[in-house]
C-alpha cells in the first residue's frame, strides 16, 4: 500500500507565439482545480477508461479575475498535493492523465459551471520511495509544470511497496537474516509472512501465508511468466509449468467495492459502480459535495452543500455514471434496423438509413405493400426489403401497368403457334400434340396421354390458356 503524490507547480501559457486567452474575465471570474487519473502499465487507453490505480481531485484555487489588457499569467493554483492512495503493490510503470478544470463563478443558472481547460497525459516508469520527479507537459497553448512521486505507507517499503517493515525488537541490530529497512534505519525488514518460496520480485502478500502475483506473473509462487500462447485445454495445462492462466477467484469475489458499490468484471480487473456520494476505484471516497466538483466530463452538479446530503450529477449526452465518468457507447445497443448505420452525434443518436427505409430507427420499409396498389388486378408481394407485383395475365412491369406480350416467352411446346388473345394466349398445336401449351403427344391409336382432352375438343384444335 502507498500513496501517489502530485504537486502542481504552475499552469499558464506555454512558450512561443499564440498565447492563449485568459480563461477568466472581469465578467466571468473563475478558479482552477485539477483532476489526476492513474492507470497501471504503459496503457494507451482513452481518457474515459477507468482509472484503475485511482483518481483524485484537488481543492479549488483562488478566485482569479483577468486584468484587462494584461497577458494571461500563470494562473493561481490550489494549495496542497493531490494524493492517490493505492492499496496493492505499486506497478512501477503507470499512465497518468492530469486535467485542468475551470470553475466559472459568474451568474450561472444552477450554480457554478465547469469546463475542461486542458488535458495532458503520459506514460512513465517510477519506483516507489524515490525522489520527486519533475515534468513539463503542454496542452495546446497551455503549459503544466508538476512533480510526482510514489511513497509507501508503513509498514510497506521497497520499490513496489511489497516488503514490510517493523520497529526493531533489539536496539542494536535486526534479527537473523533480516536487513535494516532503508531509509528507515531504525526499523527492520519484517519476518517473512508470505507463503514460503513466494517470489520476492514478482510476488507479494497482504496476509500471512498468501502469495499474490504482480501483473505478468503466475503460479503458486509467482515464479512463472504468463504465457501469451493459448493453453491446450479450457483450463490449460499445469499452470506451474507452462504459465497458462488458470481461472482462479474472480476479481469481484468478496466484492471489493465499498459503501454499497456494485462490482462488475472487466477484461483486466473490475469496476465499481458507486452509489451517489461515493467515488474512487473502490467507492472509498465519501463525504463529497458539489463543492468538490465530483461530476466529470462537463456534468452539472446539483444537490447538497453539506457532506450528509447527496449530490446528483446531470451528465451531458454521451456520458453516464453517478459522476458522469463513463462514456456511453450508445450505438453498441444496435438501435438501427434494416442495415442502418448508427451515428453518435454527442447530443443525439442518428440512424443513417439504407435506400428504401426511413424512420428514427430505419424501421419503416418505404417499399412495402402498404398503400401500394398493383394495377390491372395484380397482387402485391413483400420480400427482401422491397415490394413486387405479381401481375395478372397480359400485364407486366413494376406496377403491372405495362401490357405484356403473352407470346414473348414462346409458351407453346413442340412447334405450336402462339396467338395473343384478350384473355391470355392461345396455342395452335402442331399435328400429334395437344394441351393448353401443346405439351401432350397424341398416341397413334387416337388415345391421348394424360390428361384426357375435354369433351368436344378434338386433338389438334387450338387450346386456349386461361
Amino acid at each position: 500500500a502507498g500513496v501517489f503524490e502530485l504537486q502542481i507547480h504552475s499552469f499558464g501559457p506555454g512558450p512561443g507565439p499564440g498565447a492563449p486567452r485568459s480563461p477568466c474575465s472581469a465578467r466571468l471570474p473563475c478558479r482552477l482545480f485539477f483532476r489526476v487519473c492513474l492507470k497501471p502499465g504503459l496503457s494507451e487507453e482513452a481518457a474515459e477508461s477507468p482509472c484503475a490505480l485511482g483518481a483524485a481531485l484537488s481543492a479549488r484555487g483562488p478566485v482569479y479575475t483577468e486584468q484587462p489588457g494584461a497577458p494571461a499569467p500563470d494562473l493561481p493554483l490550489p494549495d496542497g498535493l493531490l494524493q492517490v492512495p493505492f492499496r496493492d503493490a505499486w506497478p512501477g510503470t503507470f499512465s497518468f492523465i492530469i486535467e485542468t478544470w475551470r470553475e466559472e463563478l459568474g451568474d450561472q443558472i444552477g450554480g457554478p459551471a465547469w469546463s475542461l481547460l486542458a488535458r495532458v497525459a503520459g506514460r512513465r516508469r517510477l519506483a516507489a520511495g524515490g525522489p520527486w520527479a519533475r515534468d513539463i507537459q503542454r496542452a495546446g497553448a497551455w503549459e503544466l509544470r508538476f512533480s510526482y512521486r510514489a511513497r509507501c505507507e508503513p509498514p510497506a517499503v521497497g520499490t513496489a511497496c511489497t516488503r514490510l517493515c517493523r520497529p526493531r525488537s533489539a536496539p542494536s541490530r535486526c534479527g537473523p537474516g533480516l536487513r535494516p529497512c532503508a531509509p528507515l534505519e531504525d526499523e527492520c525488514e519484517a519476518p517473512l509472512v508470505c507463503r514460503a518460496g513466494c517470489s520476492p520480485e514478482h510476488g507479494f502478500c497482504e496476509q500471512p501465508g498468501e502469495c499474490r502475483c504482480l501483473e505478468g506473473w503466475t503460479g503458486p509462487l509467482c515464479t512463472v511468466p504468463v504465457s501469451t500462447s493459448s493453453c491446450l485445454s479450457p483450463r490449460g495445462p499445469s499452470s506451474a509449468t507452462t504459465g497458462c492462466l488458470v481461472p482462479g477467484p474472480g476479481p469481484c469475489d468478496g466484492n471489493p467495492c465499498a459503501n454499497g458499490g456494485s462490482c462488475s468484471e472487466t477484461p483486466r480487473s473490475f469496476e465499481c459502480t458507486c452509489p451517489r456520494g461515493f467515488y474512487g476505484l473502490r467507492c472509498e471516497v465519501s463525504g463529497v459535495t458539489c463543492a468538490d466538483g465530483p461530476c466529470f466530463n462537463g456534468g452539472l452538479c446539483v444537490g447538497g452543500a453539506d457532506p450528509d446530503s447527496a449530490y446528483i450529477c446531470h451528465c451531458p449526452p454521451g456520458f453516464q455514471g453517478s459522476n458522469c465518468e463513463k462514456r456511453v457507447d450508445r450505438c453498441s445497443l444496435q438501435p438501427c434496423r434494416n442495415g442502418g448505420l448508427c451515428l453518435d452525434l454527442g447530443h443525439a443518436l442518428r440512424c443513417r438509413c439504407r435506400a428504401g427505409f426511413a424512420g428514427p430507427r430505419c424501421e419503416h420499409d418505404l417499399d412495402d405493400c402498404a398503400g401500394r396498389a398493383c394495377a390491372n388486378g395484380g397482387t402485391c408481394v413483400e420480400g427482401g426489403g422491397a415490394h413486387r407485383c405479381s401481375c395478372a395475365l397480359g400485364f407486366g412491369g413494376r406496377d403491372c401497368r405495362e401490357r405484356a406480350d403473352p407470346c414473348a416467352a414462346r409458351p407453346c411446346a413442340h412447334g405450336g403457334r402462339c396467338y395473343a388473345h384478350f384473355s391470355g394466349l392461345v396455342c395452335a398445336c402442331a399435328p400429334g400434340y395437344m394441351g393448353a401449351r401443346c405439351e401432350f403427344p397424341v398416341h397413334p391409336d387416337g388415345a391421348s396421354a394424360l390428361p384426357a382432352a375435354p369433351p368436344g375438343l378434338r386433338p389438334g384444335d387450338p387450346q386456349r390458356y386461361l
Epitope: 457507447d329 450508445r330 453498441s332 444496435q334 442495415g339 448505420l341 448508427c342 451515428l343 453518435d344
Partner: antibody, heavy 124, light 110 residues
Framework: QVQLQQSGPGLVKPSQTLSLTCAIS??????????WNWIRQSPSRGLEWLGW?????????DYAVSLKSRITINPDTSKNQFSLQLNSLTPEDTAVYYC??????????????WGQGTMVTVSS | QSALTQPPSASGTPGQRVTISCSGS????????INWYQQLPGTAPKLLIY???QRPSGVPDRFSGSKSGTSASLAISGLQSEDEADYYC???????????FGTGTKVTVL
C-alpha cells in the same frame, strides 16, 4: 491490435478485372460495429471512396455511384477477410488502393485502421 | 471532382497556429459528421479527427476540429515540424449515397 494486410497484383491489363484481398487480424469482418471499405488514391482524382461491406444481422454493401456497374466487395467470414473486384479496367483506374476499417462505435465514417496500400497500374 | 473543397496549401512557423478550411454542401457537411485525415509522405492516411471534433486515442490535443453549417475547419496549434503533411476532410454525402473526400491541403512548416 487491429491490422489489415492487403494482397493482389500490381499490374493489370486494360479491360481485365482487378482482384484485391484484405485480411483482417484483431477484429472480425462480421463485427456488428465495424464497416470495411476500399478507398483509392491517385494524383488526378485524390482520395476516392469505392465502397464498403458491413454486417448488421446480415451483410450489406454500398458502392460509389460512379463505379456501381463494375465493382463488387465481398466479405469472407471463413477467412476473416474481404475482397474488391473491379472489372473493365482502364488506365484511369491506376491508383494506390487501400482497405480500411471504420471501427469507432457511433462513428462508422471515421476510418481508423488502414492497410498498407497496393499500387495498381493498369497498362498493356 | 471532389465534393469538398480545401485550400491547396497552408504554412506556418513552429509554435504557430494553422487553420485549414473545408467547404461542402447541405448533403454532406451540412447533415453529416466530418472527419479529418493526416497523410505523412509515403504512408497511408491516418484518422486525426472524427465526428467533427473527437480525437482518437494517441492524437495530440494540438489538433482540434470544428464545424459550422456547410463548412468545417481543422486547427493545429503549436505547429511542429512533424505536422508537415497532407490533410484531408471527409464526410458522407446523402445525395451521392457515399463518402466524399476533400481536395487535400499540404501543410508546410517554415
Amino acid at each position: 491490435q487491429v491490422q489489415l494486410q492487403q494482397s493482389g497484383p500490381g499490374l493489370v491489363k486494360p479491360s481485365q478485372t482487378l482482384s484485391l484481398t484484405c485480411a483482417i487480424s484483431g477484429d472480425s469482418v462480421s463485427s456488428n460495429s465495424a464497416v470495411w471499405n476500399w478507398i483509392r488514391q491517385s494524383p488526378s482524382r485524390g482520395l476516392e471512396w469505392l465502397g464498403w461491406t458491413y454486417y448488421r444481422s446480415k451483410y450489406y454493401n454500398d458502392y460509389a455511384v460512379s463505379l456501381k456497374s463494375r465493382i463488387t466487395i465481398n466479405p469472407d467470414t471463413s477467412k476473416n477477410q474481404f475482397s474488391l473486384q473491379l472489372n473493365s479496367l482502364t488506365p484511369e483506374d491506376t491508383a494506390v488502393y487501400y482497405c480500411t476499417r471504420g471501427g469507432i462505435v457511433g462513428a462508422p465514417d471515421g476510418f481508423d485502421i488502414w492497410g498498407q496500400g497496393t499500387m495498381v497500374t493498369v497498362s498493356s | 471532382q471532389s465534393a469538398l473543397t480545401q485550400p491547396p496549401s497552408a504554412s506556418g512557423t513552429p509554435g504557430q497556429r494553422v487553420t485549414i478550411s473545408c467547404s461542402g454542401s447541405n448533403s454532406n457537411i451540412g447533415s453529416n459528421p466530418i472527419n479529418w485525415y493526416q497523410q505523412l509522405p509515403g504512408t497511408a492516411p491516418k484518422l486525426l479527427i472524427y465526428s467533427n471534433n473527437q480525437r482518437p486515442s494517441g492524437v495530440p490535443d494540438r489538433f482540434s476540429g470544428s464545424k459550422s453549417g456547410t463548412s468545417a475547419s481543422l486547427a493545429i496549434s503549436g505547429l511542429q515540424s512533424e505536422d508537415e503533411a497532407d490533410y484531408y476532410c471527409a464526410a458522407w454525402d446523402d445525395s451521392l449515397n457515399g463518402h466524399v473526400f476533400g481536395t487535400g491541403t499540404k501543410v508546410t512548416v517554415l
